[in-house]
Amino acid sequence: WPPPGTGDVVVQAPTQVPGFLGDSVTLPCYLQVPNMEVTHVSQLTWARHGESGSMAVFHQTQGPSYSESKRLEFVAARLGAELRNASLRMFGLRVEDEGNYTCLFVTFPQGSRSVDIWLRVLAKPQNTAEVQKVQLTGEPVPMARCVSTGGRPPAQITWHSDLGGMPNTSQVPGFLSGTVTVTSLWILVPSSQVDGKNVTCKVEHESFEKPQLLTVNLTVYYPPEVSISGYDNNWYLGQNEATLTCDARSNPEPTGYNWSTTMGPLPPFAVAQGAQLLIRPVDKPINTTLICNVTNALGARQAELTVQVKEGPPSEHSGISRN
């Protein structure tokens, strides 16, 4: 807005005013009169660009008149008072109200003074983000979905992740006329490493003070990935019990663990305890390949480990894991 004291009477108004669909909005418009300057305002007029006639007029002697009396109101102009504030309130904002408006003061002896204001009709979108639960496909698939519903103008959606991925964004008309629903899919080749990781959907819109961040926890369904731990290649006769653990990562969780050997069932010195296998002390050397088979809803996977129990005295720092 221009600084005061410029000599001429000046109409002050913002260049753009935002309003929300269905709500009311005030288009501010004031006459700035320099000190000592005498001016007389006989009429205030609001007109919309591209339309003939005025939408609102306030006359010094006749008061207000409106093209749509239920939707328009001068907020400060009063009969018998100095007309310096032409601010106009609009009720029940519609999409078609968006556009350029002219606020005009008829002043004497300075002449008519006007300013243009752009009314922006906004609709605040509702935002949701959800995981798209997937299985291992070997192909890029949507793994997360972010939806901004009923925005005007359309919201901007971006994805933030350390995992890579590609967005695929589309728009469709919203439920209310003039609004838009934006859907963005985050696409990646599923892998077990991605399961449980987070991606963030960022939604930006004129109506937001700051971007909205929605976090999605990724879900990849995959069969068990199995390994056996607890053996260090230094097991000797006469040592204490040792424990092997069948380590399984899977989604959903494993439903069963089955221990066996390549020769068939477990030997007497090996006792299965769910995911663990207890190896009791033995009195003669062993060379056996153990198998752990893990099952979940998507299938079964197994790991093998060849265990040797050797002759010879164990040193202090070697041997099987002790209880």
């Epitope: 000599g7 001429d8 320099p34 000592m36 300057e37 005498v38 007389h40 006989s42 006359h59 010094q60 002697t61 018998g80 008829v106 004497f108 002896p109 300075q110 002449g111 008519s112």
Partner: antibody
């Protein structure tokens, strides 16, 4: 057409008052600004005041404040200027002038024929 | 009060161009003085020509134009006609009152 018809010539003694009328026709009187201007013999023009006919809002030249009163009668579309405590240097032709608007600016559009006021003892 | 000064008289040939000026004793004339120009032909009523520095009144021939010229208001007559012979007054607005100039007698000869 737009016309301003003023009252006839006046001869007044010093200290007296005079009230000059200006009857408008051909336009919406209540939406108009009317200025009063005078021209002393052999002199240029001197602006006295303006009035907004619709409300009676006025703005006076400080030189005349306290001695001049402008009024309107909207029922007869007539503007009045009363000048009190007349002196000999108030002898002049008094004009009413309606201001017209070009949209961006105002101008002295239509003038009355003038009323001669003579102040003489 | 401010004093507004005009050329007492100017002469222009028919078809010629002449510029009448209006100077303010308070300094440069600006658009905030809303310069007005008024014409008075002998034996006729006054007639407004220009308002707000450069806005021509309806019905006024295009040969009349108002402007600011340096630190003065100006009325330029391009292609003068014999019927333009008249007295021309300017009026300037000073925040709360108008001040008229002494007038310029324009002769078309």
């Amino acid at each position: 057409q737009v016309q301003l018809v003023q009252s006839g010539a006046e001869v007044k003694k010093p200290g007296a008052s005079v009230k000059v009328s200006c009857k408008a026709s051909g336009y919406t009187f209540t939406s108009s600004y009317i200025s009063w201007v005078r021209q002393a013999p052999g002199q240029g023009l001197e602006w006295i005041a303006w009035i907004y006919a619709g409300t009676g809002d006025t703005n006076y030249n400080q030189k005349f404040t306290g001695r001049v009163t402008m009024t309107t009668d909207t029922s007869t579309s007539t503007a009045y200027m009363e000048l009190r405590s007349l002196r000999s240097d108030d002898t002049a032709v008094y004009y009413c002038a309606r201001h017209g608007s070009t949209g961006r600016g105002w101008y002295f559009a239509v003038w009355g024929q003038g009323t001669t006021v003579t102040v003489s003892s | 009060q401010a004093v507004v000064t005009q050329e007492p008289s100017l002469t222009v040939s028919p078809g010629g161009t002449v510029t009448l000026t209006c100077r303010s004793s308070t300094g440069a004339v600006t658009t905030s003085n809303y310069a007005n120009w008024v014409q008075q032909k002998p034996g006729q009523a006054f007639r407004g020509l220009i308002g707000g520095t450069n806005n021509r009144a309806p019905g006024v021939p295009a040969r009349f134009s108002g402007s600011l010229l340096g630190d003065k208001a100006a009325l330029t007559l391009s292609g003068a006609q014999p019927e333009d012979e008249a007295e021309y007054y300017c009026a300037l607005w000073y925040s709360n009152h108008f001040v008229f100039g002494g007038g310029t007698k324009l002769t078309v000869l």
